[in-house]
């Protein structure tokens, strides 16, 4: 019997599945090389990293930045740091210029006007 | 239009606010609400650590609440554990 997945579990499953969709393509099946990472960013983060996607060097710099153990590959542990940072940045954008009481969300990363 | 991955990231924000809005301090999840979050949103292998242990680990600025940044540490740890588990499952098959 499989339990019904919670909202958070579904979100995490999407992250894992996306990672695996690209990691299995070349070389080690559970790490992203530079080509796999670039493709993932170009296709699956086309809105969140819209500006960055215009410059390949910036994407290379992002990969280098995430590659904590400097092995030129991204493990899932390193990749999820990108997911968390983008989530934080999106949340910040939703609250940009917030003042006064109440809790309202404006569009997050990649939504509305850039 | 946002991709599935981008929607999932924004949906993580919604999960946090489901619990931060309980007490009305929109960017704070208190101990008892973290317990609810763990029970509702997290699998057994995350829950078994216990809400108090998680709270101590996540409240890095020791202000008695889990802010959004601190909640993301839970998401990272849960993600890493789920990823590991996904490989264990596939090895079983």
């Amino acid at each position: 019997m499989t339990c019904k997945m919670s909202q958070l579990e579904r979100n995490i499953e999407t992250i894992i599945n996306t990672f695996h969709q690209y990691s299995v393509k070349l070389g080690h099946p559970d790490t992203l090389n530079q080509g796999e990472f670039k493709e993932l960013v170009r296709k699956d983060l086309q809105n969140f990293l819209k500006k960055e996607n215009k410059n390949e060097k910036v994407i290379e710099h992002i990969m280098e930045d995430l590659d904590t153990n400097a092995d030129k590959q991204l493990s899932f542990e390193e990749f999820i740091m990108l997911m968390a940072r983008l989530t934080w940045a999106s949340h910040e954008k939703m609250h940009e210029g917030d003042e006064g009481p109440g809790h309202h969300h404006k569009p997050g990363l990649g939504e509305g006007t850039p | 239009m946002l991709t599935e991955l981008e929607k999932a990231l924004n949906s993580i924000i919604d999960v946090y606010h489901k619990y931060s809005l309980i007490k009305g301090n929109f960017h704070a999840v208190y101990r008892d609400d973290l317990k609810k979050l763990l029970e509702t949103e997290c699998p057994q292998y995350i829950r078994k650590k216990g809400a108090d242990v998680w709270f101590k680990e996540l409240d890095i600025n020791t202000d008695g609440a889990v802010n959004f940044q601190e909640f993301l540490i839970l998401v990272i740890k849960m993600g890493v554990a789920a990823h590991k588990k996904s490989h264990e499952e596939s090895h079983k098959e």
Epitope: I62, R85, L86, E92 | -
Partner: antibody, heavy 111, light 103 residues
Framework: PELVKSGASVKISCKAS????????INWVKQSNGKSLEWIGL????????FYNQKFKGKATLTVDQSSSTAYMQLNSLTSEDSAVYYC????????????WGQGTTLTVSS | ASLAVSLGQRATISCRAS??????????MNWFQLKPGQPPKLLIY???KQGSGVPARFSGSGSGTDFSLNIHSMEEDDTAMYFC?????????FGGGTKLEIK
């Protein structure tokens, strides 16, 4: 405070407690003449990966002992220029800021 | 650099990075306060987020290369050195510091 002879080496330790040691980077910072702050380098205790300020390459060596949750910085071939206060600082991995600092070790190099 | 501000007045300290410190939509710019005989104290992280236990009179703003630290009402206790620091990449770097004094 450490009083060391010129030309010698010193190993400064930084013991972490109250948190998961591998969840944060450890950075080392030099404070000279009570004023300026200089970043020496960082170590990721999870992987043991180190990054150094070019200026301190060959001067400083960063290591960690996971079993005792302790970070170390060895400084070699000491000169009077190395006399300073040395701090270790914990850095959050997500947003990368130094949220907790050690009390500092005062190093005096005597000729 | 040094700055003298009267008690109760606003103090603004600026910091310019040689290149953008933004990545992932986050500005990796932090501010520290340094007092004699004490370790540096985090005031602001990610350009505008307040550190733990930091008085509300301290705020940070900016993105890209230009940042500022504001103290909206100067108090005696705020006499100190203030440093900006980028954590976008290694080497992490600190600004030269600004000495804030009472006028």
């Amino acid at each position: 405070p450490e009083l060391v002879k010129s030309g010698a080496s010193v190993k400064i330790s930084c013991k972490a407690s109250g948190y998961s040691f591998t969840d944060y980077n450890i950075n080392w910072v030099k404070q000279s003449n009570g004023k300026s702050l200089e970043w020496i380098g960082l170590i990721n205790p999870n992987y043991g990966t180190t990054f150094y300020n070019q200026k301190f390459k060959g001067k400083a060596t960063l290591t960690v002992d996971q079993s005792s949750s302790t970070a170390y910085m060895q400084l070699n071939s000491l000169t009077s220029e190395d006399s300073a206060v040395y701090y270790c600082a914990r850095e959050t991995l997500l947003l990368r800021y130094f949220d907790y600092w050690g009390q500092g070790t005062t190093l005096t190099v005597s000729s | 650099a040094s700055l003298a501000v009267s008690l109760g007045q606003r103090a603004t300290i600026s910091c310019r990075a040689s290149e953008s410190v933004d990545i992932y939509g986050i500005s990796f710019m932090n501010w520290f306060q340094l007092k004699p005989g004490q370790p540096p104290k985090l005031l602001i992280y990610a350009a505008s987020k307040q550190g733990s236990g930091v008085p509300a009179r301290f705020s940070g703003s900016g993105s890209g290369t230009d940042f500022s630290l504001n103290i909206h009402s100067m108090e005696e206790d705020d006499t100190a050195m203030y440093f900006c620091q980028q954590s976008k990449e290694v080497p992490r770097t600190f600004g030269g510091g600004t000495k804030l004094e009472i006028k």
